[in-house]
Structures are given as C-alpha cells and as structure tokens.
C-alpha cells in the first residue's frame, strides 16, 4: 500500500532572486484533489493553502509581498489528499537581490578579444563578503562562484565566440543574500565562427531568465508563469 | 500603509475567556491574509492562529479548541476569542497582516508578515 504520495513540483515566479521589497510569488503543483498545500521554509511550517474546489485545482500560489532577508533561504512544499500526504518537493532557494552595496566588474585584456585568448573577469566589492557570483546572460546564462575578501577572479580560459555576451556579478553575503548586481560587461569575441559548434552550452537558466529578474527590479511586475525550474538551483549548492 | 491596534487584553483567571480585538486601518483589509502572534516574558515570538482572506484558518496545537479566530471586513476587525485560558497563555499578543495576498493563502510564519500592531497584555494568574 502507497504510504506517501508523489512530490509536487515548487518554483518562483517570476524569479528566484528576488529584489529586496520586491514580490514573488511561490508556486507549488501538486495533484487534483489535494485538500491542502504546506509550504515550509527553512525546515519549519511558512504557509498553508488549502485549494477550493480542490478536485478542480492542482497548483496552488503563495504570494510574497515584501521580500526581505528574512525570507530568503531554502522553500519546499508538501501537499495531502484525504490523509495522505506527499514526499517534500525538492528545495526552492529564494534568494534575495539588492543587498547593501554594487560591485564592480572589469574584464582581462579587454571586452573585444580575439578567439583562443584567455580572458578573466574580476568582481570586486569593498564590503564584507568573500563569496561572488558571475552571471552570463542569455539562454545559457552561465553561473560561476568565485572567493576572495575583496575580488574575486573568474578565468574563462581560451575563449571562443560562445563565450560572446553581457556578464554581470553579484557580492553574496551568504547563499541566499546577494548584493545589487553590477554593471553590465559586454564581452566581445572575434574569431572563426565554425569554433562555436563546439562550445558545449550550460542550460542553468530559461532563456529569458535575466530578462525577468531585471524586469521585477524595475518594475516589480508579476509574470503569471513559470520561468524558473528548481533544477538550475543545483548553482546554490 | 496598514495601522492595526490591538485591545481586549487584560487580568484572567485560569478557565476564564477573552475576547482580543485589532482594528485595522485603510481599505486593504478585505485583502490582507491575518494573524495572532504572542510573546512570553523571556521568549520568543510565537504563532498562535491566522486567518486568509477567504476565512481558511490555522492554529498552533497548544490552542487548537479553545481559541477561534474570526474576521468581520465590514468593520475592518480581526478577533481572537480565547477560552480554557491557562498561566501559560500569558502573554503579549500581537496582531500581523500580510497585505497583498491571494484568497486561499494562511501565514504561519512570523517572517512573511509585512505590518504588525504594537501587542496588548494577556494576563493568566489566579
């Protein structure tokens, strides 16, 4: 006899960095017929839905006013039908943007490089944090930890037109609080086109992911689906 | 912006009931998920029982029977009527929003609350 029922899938929308102050909206999906929803956060009970008329609903949808540090961490969701309740979801990390202060990012030799160079980015940040992030736009936004009290280097290696595109770095004062992001780096390789095939392509993030997180800094609308999956997450951990 | 006081606290005996209230201010009321929290001298912050907007309610374990929560959005009120009052139930219980919410959405986390009220006394003692 089946003692537990399947996982529900959890996600952010829009995004999983949220801006501080900003809102974000949690969503769980489980199965039709689920009387109740729990999310929990950090181990302990956050929030309870309980879907009406609940054979009609399979998602439910926690919505975050005022994102804060307090709420940034690790988010998983349960949910029962009858009696029985689900396994956990996996882990959600809500992370929150916007923190203290802005780094500086610069790259080595130059933003116009030629195929097969070495480049290196550098993030830099004056204030306590020994943990940075460099993030790549586009649809395979490619996200690198690097560690140093004040800078952090990022060696990309020989790179090859794949490595074309805008970079941006985060400070990150643990896990789940990040700093403003930088300013925009555009990285612009020249070389033989035919190289690129071989570039193999990390698909962390959707291919509008940056879009959105720039869109609720600015605006702090809600996109009413899903463009996070909980698998890119594996970055955090 | 949301105010909420509290009143209705005071001197109990064990056994005795109370009826908590917390007045809200501003139009958001309608749309704001609620909350009872306490807080014991020495210790911290506590859930005690919420309400959504559509009136699904939750309630910590050591309370669950003899306190009932209730919204009136008419008056903009929340309510905690409190019976089969014990010593420990002393405390200082504050009222929280989160504001704004979907409709089915229950808060037991002290975190996700975004407006709060300055407390009122709960005193158990014979």
């Known amino acids: 006899q089946q003692q537990t029922l399947p996982k529900p899938f959890i996600w952010a929308e829009p995004h999983f960095m949220v801006p501080k102050e900003k809102q974000v909206t949690i969503c769980c999906q489980g199965n039709y017929g689920a009387v109740e929803y729990q999310l929990h956060f950090e181990g302990s009970l956050f929030a309870v839905d309980r879907p009406k008329p609940p054979e009609r609903i399979n998602k439910v949808k926690f919505y975050i006013p005022d994102m804060n540090s307090r709420m940034a961490g690790q988010y998983s969701c349960i949910y029962r039908v009858g009696e029985l309740w689900s396994e956990p979801s996996n882990l959600l990390d809500l992370v929150v943007t916007e923190m203290y202060d802005t780094p500086t990012l610069s790259v080595h030799p130059g933003p116009e490089v030629i195929s097969g160079e070495k480049v290196t980015f550098y993030c830099r940040l004056d204030t306590a944090t020994s943990m940075f992030l460099l993030l790549k736009e586009g649809r395979s936004s490619h996200v690198q930890r690097g560690y140093g009290k004040v800078q952090a280097e990022f060696p990309l290696g020989p790179v090859t037109t794949a490595h074309r595109g805008t970079y941006r770095c985060f400070g990150s004062y643990n896990n789940h609080a990040w700093s403003f992001p930088s300013e925009p780096v555009k990285l612009l390789v020249t070389g033989d086109i035919e190289n690129t095939s071989l570039a193999p392509e990390d698909p962390t993030f959707p291919a509008d992911t940056w879009g959105t997180y720039l869109l609720t800094t600015e605006t702090g609308l809600q996109k009413d689906h899903a463009l996070w999956d909980h698998t890119a997450q594996n970055l955090l951990r | 912006e949301v105010q909420l006081v509290e009143s209705g606290g005071g001197e109990v005996q064990p056994g005795g009931s109370l009826r908590l209230s917390c007045a809200a201010s501003?139009?958001?009321?309608?749309?704001?998920?609620m909350g009872w929290f306490r807080q014991a001298p020495g210790k911290e912050r506590e859930f005690v029982a919420a309400i959504s907007r559509s009136d699904d309610t939750y309630y910590a374990e050591s309370v669950k029977g003899r306190f009932t929560i209730s919204r009136d959005n008419a008056k903009n009120t929340l309510y905690l009527q409190m019976s089969s009052l014990r010593a420990e139930d002393t405390a200082v219980y504050y009222c929280?929003?989160?504001?704004?919410?979907?409709?089915?959405?229950?808060?037991?986390?002290?975190?996700?609350?975004?407006?709060w009220g300055q407390g009122t006394l709960v005193t158990v003692k014979p």
């Open positions: 501003g139009r958001t009321f309608a749309s704001a998920a």
């Open positions: 929280a929003a989160v504001v704004p919410t979907y409709g089915n959405n229950i808060y037991v986390h002290s975190a996700a609350y975004n407006y």
